[in-house]
Interface confidence: medium
Amino acid sequence: AQNITARIGEPLVLKCKGAPKKPPQRLEWKLNTGRTEAWKVLSPQGGGPWDSVARVLPNGSLFLPAVGIQDEGIFRCQAMNRNGKETKSNYRVRVYQIPGKPEIVDSASELTAGVPNKVGTCVSEGSYPAGTLSWHLDGKPLVPNEKGVSVKEQTRRHPETGLFTLQSELMVTPARGGDPRPTFSCSFSPGLPRHRALRTAPIQPRVWEPVPLEEVQLVVEPEGGAVAPGGTVTLTCEVPAQPSPQIHWMKDGVPLPLPPSPVLILPEIGPQDQGTYSCVATHSSHGPQESRAVSISIIEPGEEGPTAGSVGGSGLGTLALA
């Protein structure tokens, strides 16, 4: 069978090969389409309700004034010329409709790096057959389920026209340190070959890089954390975050049973105060953050103190694992 594609709503003429150019003709057309239950036979005499759908022209061709989805199917013509030679024509008719230009709706103006974001929803209305939607980043096809890309698709069919509406929702996880203004577009590829893709206007959301949590700083006075017996050590916890979080104090990896405070004063230092101190900021929006540890030690008279900033100490050296 010869494949014929016709646009919905447009006329179609199918030639009956071997038929005399004008009556009298011995020919018949047989149709098996969405309009017929089995084979429907049409003759040049015509007449009746079928004339509005398909009729045989004086030259034997079959004329369909406006093809529809129901006209998809097989069309056969059997004709006999003046010498009694029989010729058969066989057509497989498929119809199509190009939708309007696809559009991206509900598009995001800003994406957050490192987390999944909805970019937008691509919509194509009025296609037949359904066709497909695909997404592009900077002109290159995006592959679903690769590198933080996911696509949710939906296909609906209009109950009266039979035409398709396609929707495709794109989710991406932009890489940190990536392109700050990526270009996304969506294209519709028709279900029938030989028709070019239709592409949306591009969108260019901004990519916002969440600022990493600023470090909690622990300042010790005297610098280096070495003090003579009976001296005083002041530990100050500096947190840039706003609003100010609660500050808790740890010694050798164990919280000290003290009310929250950004300053810890150790007056009249004794041997029991020696150890590794750190502060912990507790925020309502995310988990606690801990400073680096500082080592507090006692210098006996005549001893040299440790070099300034003996930071890092025993971390969890003892952690009350007695």
């Epitope: 909690v216 990896g253 750190s278 801990e290 680096r292 540890a293 890092g312 969890l316 952690l319 694992l321």
Partner: nanobody, 117 residues
């Protein structure tokens, strides 16, 4: 990025049990001692229990000794806290904490445990 994710919290009646888990990613788990620290409503941080990097030694706060058990599975990068005979005083956010010499401690987001009848 270092990440500690706690789970297993919930509402339980007095005398009941819960098992908290903390899955760690982004660093060499077996090199870190792990501990559980809790914060009751309106209170400061309270250390609950700790386990050494190899799991050979554990310790507990007096208030939970005999009721709570800490363990770790280095193959699964996970530390557990089995909590039995729970009491209303155990109601708190429970944080998982990883630390080793010379590094700031790393903390999870916490999981809420509520003991109430």
């Amino acid at each position: 990025a270092v990440q500690l994710v706690e789970s297993g919290g919930g509402l339980v009646q007095p005398g009941g049990s819960l098992r908290l888990s903390c899955v760690v990613s982004g660093f060499t788990f077996r090199s870190y001692a792990m501990s559980w620290v809790r914060q009751a409503p309106g209170k400061g941080l309270e250390w609950v229990s700790a386990i050494t990097s190899g799991g050979e030694s554990t310790s507990y706060a007096g208030s939970v000794k005999g009721r709570f058990t800490i363990s770790r599975d280095n193959a699964k990068n996970t530390v557990y806290l089995q909590m039995n005979s729970l009491e209303p005083e155990d109601t708190a956010i429970y944080y998982c904490n990883a630390r080793r010499v010379g590094s700031p401690g790393s903390w999870g987001q916490g999981t809420q445990v509520t003991v109430s009848s």
